[in-house]
């Protein structure tokens, strides 16, 4: 059994999250993950899910009663999601920590927008993306 | 030329982001994107970048002078990043909108944690992930 399982059960008790009523009104993450089989699609969704958990854990960082559980779960998330790669984890953390209300950050983001957009689609690197793919307003 | 380019230039003027000094102290996104060649790694990072831009645009949704530019860029992001798939975009939006301070959301997140963790590594679905792969604490 992976180390996180016991610690996640401990968190369930702490958050009173073991009761069946918690599942009322649908799931947060599991239903969404079920929709996506392609690895790159799953990473798009899991990236948001992992950042949610990191934020949640940060909010409880001063609660000593769950520190060991949180650390063990983060350890295993880093193994599983970041493939034990500190640079990947650090780059991810940098992105999640940028403040959207910081004027300098806003200016930089807009300054980089064209180049970011040019890299967004997988085929962008090979220049193969067709105009016929373009149908969406959102 | 993709439609977003002209509109991004318009945003550069609005945010006063065209000056060379904006690039001082390094990049926000471009340096990080340069580190990752694997498609699944890129999606992890781009997921955070796209959610940043969506939040930024949301903050300026009442500013009529840039509405057309913002809408055009969002449209093109949806084409490029979500491959014109509304369900993918909607699931993504759901994940970005969950409040980490909402007690019901916290309970649900902890309730789902074990299953989310079990799905995090690519090999988890095929049951091939070996114990020997596991090393990381974060």
């Amino acid at each position: 059994q992976d180390p996180y399982v016991k610690e996640a059960e401990n968190l369930k008790k702490y958050f009173n999250a073991g009761h069946s009523d918690v599942a009322d009104n649908g799931t947060l993450f599991l239903g969404i993950l079920k929709n996506w089989k392609e690895e790159s699609d799953r990473k798009i969704m899991q990236s948001q899910i992992v950042s949610f958990y990191f934020k949640l854990f940060k909010n409880f960082k001063d609660d000593q009663s769950i520190q060991k559980s949180v650390e063990t779960i983060k350890e295993d998330m880093n193994v599983k999601f970041f493939n034990s790669n500190k640079k990947k984890r650090d780059d991810f953390e940098k992105l999640t920590n940028y403040s959207v209300t910081d004027l300098n950050v806003q200016r930089k983001a807009i300054h980089e927008l064209i180049q970011v957009m040019a890299e967004l689609s997988p085929a962008a690197k090979t220049g193969k993306r067709k105009r016929s793919q373009m149908l969406f307003r959102g | 030329q993709d439609p977003y380019v002209k509109e991004a230039e318009n945003l550069k003027k609005y945010f006063n982001a065209g000056h060379s000094d904006v690039a001082d102290n390094g990049t926000l996104f471009l340096g990080i994107l340069k580190n990752w060649k694997e498609e699944s790694d890129r999606k992890i990072m781009q997921s955070q970048i796209v959610s940043f831009y969506f939040k930024l645009f949301k903050n300026f949704k009442d500013d009529q002078s840039i509405q057309k530019s913002v809408e055009t860029i969002k449209e093109d992001m949806n084409v490029k990043f979500f491959n014109s798939n509304k369900k993918k975009r909607d699931d993504f939006e759901k994940l970005t909108n969950y409040s980490v301070t909402d007690l019901n959301v916290q309970r649900k997140a902890i309730h789902e944690l074990i299953q989310v963790m079990a799905e995090l590594s690519p090999a988890a679905k095929t049951g091939k992930r070996k114990r020997s792969q596991m090393l990381f604490r974060g």
Partner: antibody, heavy 120, light 110 residues
Amino acid sequence: EVQLLESGGGLVQPGGSLRLSCAASGFTFSSYAMSWVRQAPGKGLEWVSAISGSGGSTYYADSVKGRFTISRDNSKNTLYLQMNSLRAEDTAVYYCAKDGWNALGWLESWGQGTMVTVSS
Amino acid sequence: NFMLTQPHAVSESPGKTVTISCTGRNGNIASNYVQWYQQRPDSAPTLIIFEDTQRPSGVPTRLSGSIDTSSNSASLIISSLRTEDEADYYCQSSDSNRVLFGGGTKVTVL
């Protein structure tokens, strides 16, 4: 100050076993990953194995997989390497190293090493 | 498998600058941090650069690290070379399932 002291090296015959220990002090042992690195006489550094702070996650070089086992006892601040089915090519100085944070990354502090000689 | 390649040896006069390269093969060097270690004769290695460019406290500013994505290589730069810089230098990184060392570079101060 971080201190790492390896012990348990010595002369062993091919096919034999040895257990190396590394006593750690000067830091919160359970918060850091630990590694074993070896260096054959006159050769470069070769990473052998690593273990996470909790001990729940282990990692091995292909050359030792299935023969060596890394473990730790956080209550004793001690790291171990159980070496079985030893071969002549395992002859080396074995260093215990503390990771610079709690993951596979950079080896911030090293012990002075213990010599393992595999010979008949 | 990802590999790190270093020159076997470099030599230079005191006061000069030496650059030791560490080239990634079969993978992207920028996708993991690169570290550098110094090993003097009959001593254990010591960390001198971590996370591509960072220096641990106590390491002189004469030593610096860099990454060049275009050549897929990392470099250790030792400026104002001194006799005490004579040692073996190893680059190190990791991939998804192991830690990797380069073969080492012997620096001789002429």
